[in-house]
Amino acid sequence: LVPHLGDREKRDSVCPQGKYIHPQNNSICCTKCHKGTYLYNDCPGPGQDTDCRECESGSFTASENHLRHCLSCSKCRKEMGQVEISSCTVDRDTVCGCRKNQYRHYWSENLFQCFNCSLCLNGTVHLSCQEKQNTVCTCHAGFFLRENECVSCSNCKKSLECTKLCLPQIENVKGTEDSGTT
């Protein structure tokens, strides 16, 4: 025996891929709108066309959908140093990035700031600067890494983390001071 589908089961059954349930009649599956368009009117009945309209300037949809409105195009954040890599089209949002010799630092999932890649002065490049990561520097002897810059051990204070790295230097300075000259 084939079990009878009640209203709830019918309501819960999903439409095939590329279609969605008509909001007023869950026995009708309407075809979704293509990317670059949005839903203006649901299909009137089974096998009938959904009324989709193209997104207006300044808006987009990047995938097939049944959205009542297109999404607003993102704006690149000048105050964060961002530049436009590619402009918004009806089917693709604006792509923002950084200038050459800069990297992105993400303060949160959807917010990044552009910073200049470190040049590793008084050190060597351990890992080159990448799109989302600053250069990794290794400092020469007599220098320590502070805020990704190689700083002279003469700027190392006892309270700072640099004391271990600069210990031989500090001892040498002390030794020179302590040794009396005749």
Epitope: K78, E79, H105, W107
Partner: nanobody
Framework: EVQLLESGGGLIQPGGSLRLSCAAS????????MVWVREAPGKGLEWVSH????????YYADSVKGRFTISRDNSKNTLYLQMNSLRAEDTAVYYC????????????RGQGTLVTVSS
């Protein structure tokens, strides 16, 4: 010397409102993008909101969007954060800061003001 002094924090019931202020001195306030960040107990620093130099472009974290409003008065060298419909998860120390320029760390930020949302 750069100084940022936050005020306006306190104990507030869920659903309530608070207005934080940040008095700035020692630099040209109108030339800087300003930021509000917060640090909840046992959590890292979270970017809450920022406002550009002229107050035209603003940003809000998803967690505060529609509830918080950032503003500034360049004639008074003051940054504000209007916080409405407060929730327990908004409990944190709130700091104002100058947008970093050299790298992803805050060279200049205030001492913070504690906001506690509890019934």
């Amino acid at each position: 010397e750069v100084q940022l002094l936050e005020s306006g924090g306190g104990l507030i019931q869920p659903g309530g409102s608070l207005r934080l202020s940040c008095a700035a001195s020692g630099f040209t306030f109108a030339h800087e993008t300003m930021v509000w960040v917060r640090e909840a107990p046992g959590k890292g620093l979270e970017w809450v909101s920022h406002i550009d130099r002229v107050g035209q472009d603003t940003y809000y974290a998803d967690s505060v969007k529609g509830r918080f409003t950032i503003s500034r008065d360049n004639s008074k060298n003051t940054l504000y954060l209007q916080m409405n419909s407060l929730r327990a998860e908004d409990t944190a120390v709130y700091y104002c800061a100058i947008l970093p320029k050299r790298g992803p760390w805050f060279d200049y930020r205030g001492q913070g003001t504690l906001v506690t949302v509890s019934s």
